[in-house]
């Protein structure tokens, strides 16, 4: 029963996690304009993996896709790749885990097959979660680097009275969604792997031994008994990502005072 519960919970947690990874990948708010220096901007910029957007005071929002592959930063391409790999692995993992669920009977599938499928999906979820966490972390690192670089160059190119103020970007909502979703997928994968241990039949086969007693011959042939390992209750859920950076503007509860201007 505990094994079924662990497997089912692992599946549900992974499902939520993968849905979150998909949502994060599609979201436009991977980076949002830092409003520390200008909290009353009339034009609010934010960027995703696929397009950059502007929300105006007028209420009008316009987005422009990145219609180039070669012109994009290698890091952005890497993040895209990591997120897509995470989604693909997660989706395959979900498909495999559906058939592996103990509560679902498909033909005469043996427990050993289900155990293998559970382990496979678990590993896929773990890798999927790690891909998402890695992708989001790479993007966050890129943001931090660019943030401090643009802070250092904030008023470069001041010719006379003309200031070219660079738009600085900070963490967007998608980063937090991605971190949480990646963490959930990872936890779900670990749970599936734990469930696999409970499903796997540990067969101890004793060879048939003949005892020749006086009078008549009796053959004792004990069948292989199944030793079921109990569900380890001491498994610790590790915190994948602690908090993360928060900006003064507490990015993005749409519309927030500062970003909707």
């Amino acid at each position: 029963m505990a094994v079924t519960a662990c497997q089912g919970l692992g599946f549900v947690v992974s499902l939520i996690g993968i849905a979150g990874i998909i949502a994060a990948t599609c979201m436009d708010q991977w980076s949002t304009q830092d409003l520390y220096n200008n909290p009353v901007t009339a034009v609010f910029n934010y960027q995703g993996l696929w397009r950059s957007c502007v929300r105006e005071s007028s209420g009008f929002t316009e987005c422009r896709g990145y219609f180039t592959l070669l012109g994009l930063p290698a890091m952005l391409q890497a993040v895209r790749a990591l997120m897509i790999v995470g989604i693909v692995l997660g989706a395959i993992g979900l498909l495999v885990s559906i058939f592996a669920l103990k509560c679902i009977r498909i033909g005469s599938m043996e427990d050993s097959a289900k155990a293998n499928m559970t382990l496979t999906s678990g590993i896929m979820f773990i890798v999927s979660g790690l891909c998402a966490i890695a992708g989001v972390s790479v993007f966050a690192n890129m943001l931090v680097t660019n943030f401090w670089m643009s802070t250092a160059n904030m008023y470069t190119g001041m010719g006379g009275m003309v200031q070219t103020v660079q738009t600085r970007y900070t963490f967007g909502a998608a980063l937090f969604v991605g971190w949480v979703a990646g963490g959930l997928t990872l936890i779900g994968g670990v749970m599936m792997c734990i469930a696999c241990r409970g499903l796997a039949p540990e067969e101890t086969n004793y060879k048939a031994v003949s005892y020749h007693a006086s009078g008549h011959s009796v053959a004792y042939k004990p069948g292989g008994f199944k030793a079921s390992t109990g569900f380890g209750s001491n498994t610790k859920n590790k915190k994948i990502y602690d908090g993360g950076a928060r900006t003064e503007d507490e990015v993005q509860s749409y519309p927030s005072k500062h970003d909707y201007v």
Partner: antibody
């Protein structure tokens, strides 16, 4: 046809108060950000205040901050500008405007004259 | 605050002549999000409220004759009238739409010789 009609202007003494209204018609008022812009006699245009769709957020020119309050009543399709502690330099024609793409002001009312004088 | 400076303050031209007026901002009005310049141009005829001519620096408002054109990017912008007509006599204002406070240029007065 889009129409913006200002009212409430007039002669007021320094330190006095006045409330301007702008009746909007011909468009979905609640879906637009609205602004007030003023023009002193023989002078250029000066942005005064803006109120965002929904009315939650308001922005003011430094010259009027703390004295003027922009508000809106979407049920009445009306924009307001409450002007307190009026000064001689607030004398101007006050225009009610609608913001569109690019934060540009596509429609302007005919304006209402506010004269602050003793 | 972003300071908008227009030049010249006034100009007198003959009918049919090409005219150019400039607007300079103290900060870039180019948005990185959509690569649009947040500057608008207005025409104000005597005794009338201003009329929007261009937004996003070069996007013509509907109903504006195509003899008017807007151009420029970053901090330098231009309004051009290819062939001035009598009805173009007005004061032309540029406006920063990028950040609060919205600021207008002091205006360029166009007259006919």
């Amino acid at each position: 046809e889009v129409q913006l009609l200002e009212s409430g202007g007039g002669l007021v003494q320094p330190g006095g108060s006045l409330r301007l209204s702008c009746a909007a018609s011909g468009f979905t008022f609640s879906s637009y950000t609205m602004s007030w812009v003023r023009q002193a006699p023989g002078k250029g245009l000066e942005w005064v205040a803006t109120i965002i769709i929904g009315g939650s957020y308001t922005y003011y020119a430094d010259s009027v901050k703390g004295r003027f309050t922009i508000s809106r009543d979407n049920s009445k399709n009306t924009l307001y500008l409450q002007m307190n502690s009026l000064r001689a330099e607030d004398t101007a024609v006050y225009y009610c405007t609608r913001l569109v793409k690019g934060n540009a002001m596509d429609y302007w009312g005919q304006g209402t004259l506010v004269t602050v004088s003793s | 605050d972003i300071v908008m400076t227009q030049s010249p303050d006034s100009l007198a031209v003959s009918l049919g002549e090409r005219v150019t007026m400039n607007c300079k901002s103290s900060q870039s009005l180019l948005s990185s999000g959509n690569q649009k310049n947040y500057l608008s141009w207005y025409q104000q005829k005597p005794g009338q409220p201003p009329k929007l001519l261009f937004y996003w620096a070069s996007t013509r408002e509907s109903g504006v004759p195509d003899r008017f054109s807007g151009s420029g990017s970053g901090t330098d912008f231009t309004l051009t009238i290819s062939s001035v007509q009598a009805e173009d006599v007005a004061v032309y204002y540029c406006q920063n739409d990028y950040s609060y406070p919205f600021t207008f240029g002091q205006g360029t007065k166009l007259e006919i010789k």
